[in-house]
C-alpha cells in the first residue's frame, strides 16, 4: 500500500492525531490535503517544522498561503522562523524575524498565545 492509499484509509481518524503521528506521516508521502490539515489539533501542528509540514502536505503545501490567517496555519506560522518560511516560496508572512531568539516559556505562551521573542 502506497502513502496515498494509506492516507485515504486513515484520513477520517486524523482529527485527534498527536504530533508524533503527524511527524511519522510526514515520512510516508501521504500528500495531506489542506481540508484535512485544517481539521488537525492546533497543539499537534505547532511543533512541526517547516520541512515536516512540507513533506506532510507534499504538493498541497501551496495551500498554506490561502489559509495563512486561519488556525492552525496562522499559529503554526507564528512559531516558524521567517527564513524557513521563505524557503517555501509562497509569500507567507508572520514568522519569527531573523536574529531573534525563541524562548519556549510555557506560561508566557499559554497567556499570550505566541512565543516569547528576544531581539538581537
Amino acid at each position: 500500500m502506497n502513502g496515498s492509499e494509506y492516507f485515504v484509509k486513515i484520513q477520517s481518524f486524523l482529527g485527534g492525531a498527536p504530533t508524533e503521528d503527524l511527524k511519522a506521516l510526514s515520512q510516508q508521502n501521504v500528500s495531506m490535503d489542506l481540508a484535512t490539515f485544517m481539521k488537525l489539533r492546533t497543539d499537534a501542528v505547532l511543533p512541526l517544522t517547516v520541512a515536516e509540514v512540507q513533506k506532510l502536505l507534499g504538493p498541497h503545501v501551496e495551500g498554506l498561503k490561502a489559509e495563512e490567517r486561519h488556525r492552525p496555519v496562522r499559529d503554526w506560522i507564528l512559531r516558524q522562523r521567517q527564513d524557513d518560511l521563505d524557503t517555501l516560496g509562497l509569500g507567507l508572512q508572520g514568522g519569527i524575524p531573523n536574529g531573534y531568539l525563541v524562548l519556549d516559556l510555557s506560561m508566557q505562551e499559554a497567556l499570550s498565545g505566541t512565543p516569547c521573542l528576544l531581539g538581537p
Epitope: L34, A35, M38, K39, H60, E67, H70, L90, Q93
Partner: antibody, heavy 119, light 108 residues
Framework: DVQLQQSGPELVEPGASVRIPCKAA????????VDWVKQSHGQSLEWIGD????????IYNQKFEGKATLTVDTSSSTAYMELRSLTSEDTAVYFC????????????WGQGTTLTVSS | QVVLTQSPAIMSASPGEKVTLTCGAS???????LYWYQQKPGSSPKLWIY???NLASGVPARFSGSGSGTSYSLTISSMEAEDAASYFC?????????FGGGTKVEIK
C-alpha cells in the same frame, strides 16, 4: 450540483442590523471557507472577509471590522453575515462565495442579497 | 493594501476583434495569486481565469491570461457576443484581498 442559496432583498432602516444567510448544498461544507463580497451600484467588488467552518474563525477586511460579523452553523451548512449600525453606505448587493480550503479564488457564488438602507 | 487598477473602464469591440484588458497592481504579486472573474448584469461573478493564465472550467479557449509582477492582462482572441460582460481582476497575494474596478466589455 453546488449551490449557495442566499435570502431575498432586504429593506431596513438606518441604525438597524440585518443577518444574511447563505445555505450551502452539493459539497462537503467543512471543506470550504465561506467568503463575503460587497458590490455597490453594480460596480466594483469589495472583499469583506471569510469564515472557516471547522473553527468558526473569521478573518475580516479591516474596513469591515465592527461592521460585519461572520459565523457558520455547520449543522445546517449555513453561513451568516450580520451587518450592524446600518447607513446608506451599506446599500449594496452582498454575495457569499465558497473557497476550497487551501485554494484561492471563489469557484461558486450565491445569487446575491440586495440590501437597501433607507428610512 | 494592494490596489488593482483596470483599464479601460469600458470598451466596445466588434465580433471577431481581439480584445485586451489590463490589470495593474500597486505592488508586485506572486502570479499564482492573481485571478479574473466575469460578471453579467443581474448575475453573480464567475471564476474565469485562475493563477494568471489558467482557464476555469467551461471557459472558451479564445480567452487567455498572462502577466507577472505588477502587470497582468486578459485577452479575448476573437470577440463573440456572449463575451459582453464586466471582467474583474482579483488578488489574494496579501490581505485584504482586493478586486480591480472592472472593465465593461460591450459588443458593437
Amino acid at each position: 450540483d453546488v449551490q449557495l442559496q442566499q435570502s431575498g432583498p432586504e429593506l431596513v432602516e438606518p441604525g438597524a442590523s440585518v443577518r444574511i444567510p447563505c445555505k450551502a448544498a452539493g459539497h462537503t461544507f467543512t471543506d470550504y471557507n465561506v467568503d463575503w463580497v460587497k458590490q455597490s451600484h453594480g460596480q466594483s467588488l469589495e472583499w469583506i472577509g471569510d469564515v472557516n467552518p471547522n473553527t468558526d474563525g473569521a478573518i475580516y477586511n479591516q474596513k469591515f471590522e465592527g461592521k460585519a460579523t461572520l459565523t457558520v452553523d455547520t449543522s445546517s451548512s449555513t453561513a451568516y453575515m450580520e451587518l450592524r449600525s446600518l447607513t446608506s453606505e451599506d446599500t449594496a448587493v452582498y454575495f457569499c462565495a465558497r473557497r476550497r480550503l487551501g485554494q484561492g479564488g471563489f469557484d461558486s457564488w450565491g445569487q446575491g442579497t440586495t440590501l437597501t438602507v433607507s428610512s | 493594501q494592494v490596489v488593482l487598477t483596470q483599464s479601460p473602464a469600458i470598451m466596445s469591440a466588434s465580433p471577431g476583434e481581439k480584445v485586451t484588458l489590463t490589470c495593474g497592481a500597486s505592488s508586485s504579486l506572486i502570479s499564482k495569486y492573481l485571478y479574473w472573474y466575469q460578471q453579467k448584469p443581474g448575475s453573480s461573478p464567475k471564476l474565469w481565469i485562475y493563477s494568471t493564465s489558467n482557464l476555469a472550467s467551461g471557459v472558451p479557449a479564445r480567452f487567455s491570461g498572462s502577466g507577472s509582477g505588477t502587470s497582468y492582462s486578459l485577452t479575448i482572441s476573437s470577440m463573440e457576443a456572449e463575451d459582453a460582460a464586466s471582467y474583474f481582476c482579483h488578488q489574494w497575494s496579501s490581505y485584504p484581498y482586493t478586486f480591480g474596478g472592472g472593465t465593461k466589455v460591450e459588443i458593437k
